[in-house]
Structure formats: structure tokens, C-alpha cells
């Protein structure tokens, strides 16, 4: 029961998480400027991943895409790269998760491949997670690194001169997004692979008949087989009169190379 | 980068009218707001007029009612209409403008190399 809590906890966690992941790459405001400064009128500038955005105090705002590659920061590219790793892989991990969920039966599956199936989403949502924290981040970086050199740089141009404007700028809302929701997906695979522990048959007791010879006593016990250890026998060559028919559990049992069905 | 040029300056007897342009050319993402400063001789520097993205537009107290600013954002040029002008608008008329570059993330202020505006009879 506290398995399949936690894999469904964590599914639901990490599809919140992907579903920011996927808003905050979607969102405008990346950085944010205020040109309190300006002569003309109070102009609030935003940027996104992929448009800039202006508006201004009488109300009109107007965005335009960046629609060229190579005049982009290196920076914003990597940006935008490491978001989209973090969305495909979050979604290939919701996909597989969705399969894996313990309280969804498709066919005859085994645990041993939900087990699987959670782990690798587990792992995948913490990738995911990570991409949009490093992106996030990347990006807040730039800004910050960007925007401290932005008073020395002042040049003259053709006749003309061109120097930065002293702007106050600052994190957009999509960066805290963005922190959070990564945070939340990476939470989210952290709760899979724990639940992927916890679907993965180690100690899964079949009941199984098994005879030890040894000498000429013959002890009938119905232990149990166990997966990974092999055939349970009674290494101490005791027989076993007293009728109470005891599993593996009770009887400290210990791997043979002589035991035989 | 972004280049200012102005053009429509001269001699202009008082009472007359000229009409002043700025263009802007280069690698151009989008300005956002323009405007027109003037310097006289042993003067600073001030704002005469300027004009926002959105058509929002201000004046200095000496040129309302005789200048008018107009812009067209899609050639990225600026106007000033001069009206009725007097001696003491005698200056080096110089275009600005506010544009955000996506190269740098940041907002370049860009100045044109002006044009003179001499008002003498």
C-alpha cells in the first residue's frame, strides 16, 4: 500500500513539475526591465526564451519573436536547449510511468518490469528536473554576469554614439517557475525510485516442496523457494518429528550445493 | 549595430516651418522609443520631443502647440514637424533612440550626429 502511495505521489509530483517545466519555457518573463528613467513614458520590458516583449504605462504592449538563431547570446541558446531535454525526457518519463503505476493493470505485466519501468522514470524525471534547474539557472547567471559590465560599455558609432541604458532589471516570474517546478520533478523521480524498491520482488516466497536427503534421514518440510537464494533446506540434519509443519521463515535455512528437488 | 541619421535641417527665416527626419538602419530588433534633443551653442542639452512605441508622445513647454512628433514604426523613422519657429530654436537637432538587442540582451541607447537648425532672417 505505502508503494503504491509513493509512486502515485511521485507520478502526480512529477507531472506538476513538467507541467511548470513546460510553462515556464513557455512564458515571457525571463527578465524583466524597467525604464523608469525614460522621457517619453514608463516602458516595462520583458524578455522570454523565444520574444521580447514591451509595455508601456498607457497600456499597449506589443512582443516580437526572435526570429533569427545566430544574432542570439550562446547563453540563450543553451538555455533553450536544456529546457526542451528536460520536457522530452519528463515526458517519456510520465509516459512510462503511466504503464508502471502499480493501481493500472495492462495484461499480465510483472512486478519485475513495473519495477523496471518505475525506475526509469524515476531516473528520467530526475534528469528532467535537473535540466530545468540548470537552465533556470544559466539563465539567471547571464543576467546577473551580463548586467554588471553593462555600465562600462559605451561606444561611438558611425557619426553617431551608442551606449547601454541604465535599466533596473530583474528576475522574471518564470525564473522562480521554472526553479520550483524543476525542483518538484526532480522530488518527483526521487519518490519513483524509491518506490521502484519497494515493487521489486527480492524476497517474493513461492511455495514449494522441498527433500533433503542426507544420510539415511529423510526431513519433509514444506519451506519456501526463494528467487534469489535458491532451494531452503535443513543444513543441520535434524529430523524433524514434531508435525508442525514449519516454513522458511521459522527455520534459519542456508543454500547447499547437495540440495536437489 | 544600430545607426541614427537625420536629415531636413537648414536655414529657416522666423515663423517658418521644417520638417525633420530620422532613420534608423542596421541590425534592428525593435525600438521602442525615439525622440529629439536639442543643443544649443554654450547650452546642455534637452528633450523637445519624444514618442513611445505605442504612439505616446511628449513635449517640452517651449514647442507645444508648434512642433508635432510622428513616427512610423514599420520603416523605423522618426518626424518633427516645426512649426512657427523662432530664433531661440536655433540648435544642433540630434535623434535618440531606445532599442532593445537581443545580441546582448540589453537596451542600447543610440544617438544620431544631428543636423543644424539655424532660424535667422
Known amino acids: 500500500m505505502a508503494v503504491t502511495a509513493c509512486q502515485g505521489l511521485g507520478f502526480v509530483v512529477s507531472l506538476i513539475g513538467i507541467a511548470g517545466i513546460i510553462a515556464a519555457t513557455c512564458m515571457d518573463q525571463w527578465s524583466t526591465q524597467d525604464l523608469y528613467n525614460n522621457p517619453v513614458t514608463a516602458v516595462f520590458n520583458y524578455q522570454g526564451l523565444w520574444r521580447s516583449c514591451v509595455r508601456e504605462s498607457s497600456g499597449f504592449t506589443e512582443c516580437r519573436g526572435y526570429f533569427t538563431l545566430l544574432g542570439l547570446p550562446a547563453m540563450l541558446q543553451a538555455v533553450r536547449a536544456l529546457m526542451i531535454v528536460g520536457i522530452v525526457l519528463g515526458a517519456i518519463g510520465l509516459l512510462v510511468s503511466i504503464f508502471a503505476l502499480k493501481c493500472i493493470r495492462i495484461g499480465s505485466m510483472e512486478d519485475s518490469a513495473k519495477a523496471n519501468m518505475t525506475l526509469t522514470s524515476g531516473i528520467m524525471f530526475i534528469v528532467s528536473g535537473l535540466c530545468a534547474i540548470a537552465g533556470v539557472s544559466v539563465f539567471a547567471n547571464m543576467l546577473v554576469t551580463n548586467f554588471w559590465m553593462s555600465t562600462a560599455n559605451m561606444y561611438t558609432g558611425m557619426g553617431g554614439m551608442v551606449q547601454t541604458v541604465q535599466t533596473r532589471y530583474t528576475f522574471g516570474a518564470a525564473l522562480f517557475v521554472g526553479w520550483v517546478a524543476g525542483g518538484l520533478t526532480l522530488i518527483g523521480g526521487v519518490m519513483m525510485c524509491i518506490a521502484c524498491r519497494g515493487l521489486a520482488p527480492e524476497e517474493t516466497n513461492y511455495k514449494a516442496v522441498s527433500y533433503h536427503a542426507s544420510g539415511h534421514s529423510v526431513a519433509y518440510k514444506p519451506g519456501g523457494f526463494k528467487a534469489s537464494t535458491g532451494f531452503g533446506s535443513n543444513t543441520k540434519n535434524k529430523k524433524i518429528y514434531d508435525g508442525g509443519a514449519r516454513t522458511e521463515d521459522e527455520v534459519q535455512s542456508y543454500p547447499s550445493k547437495h540440495d536437489y528437488v | 549595430q544600430v545607426q541614427l541619421v537625420e536629415s531636413g535641417g537648414g536655414l529657416v527665416q522666423p515663423g517658418g516651418s521644417l520638417r525633420l527626419s530620422c532613420a534608423a538602419s542596421?541590425?534592428?530588433?525593435?525600438?521602442?522609443?525615439m525622440g529629439w534633443y536639442r543643443q544649443a551653442p554654450g547650452k546642455q542639452r534637452e528633450l523637445v520631443a519624444g514618442?513611445?512605441?505605442?504612439?505616446?508622445?511628449t513635449y517640452a513647454h517651449s514647442v507645444k502647440e508648434r512642433f508635432t512628433i510622428s513616427r512610423d514604426n514599420a520603416k523605423n523613422t522618426m518626424y518633427l514637424q516645426m512649426n512657427s519657429l523662432k530664433s531661440e530654436d536655433t540648435a544642433g537637432y540630434y535623434c535618440n533612440a531606445q532599442a532593445w538587442d537581443p545580441g546582448t540582451f540589453r537596451y542600447l541607447e543610440v544617438w544620431g550626429q544631428g543636423t543644424l537648425v539655424t532660424v535667422s532672417a
Open positions: 542596421g541590425n534592428i530588433f525593435r525600438i521602442d522609443t
Open positions: 514618442i513611445s512605441r505605442g504612439g505616446t508622445t
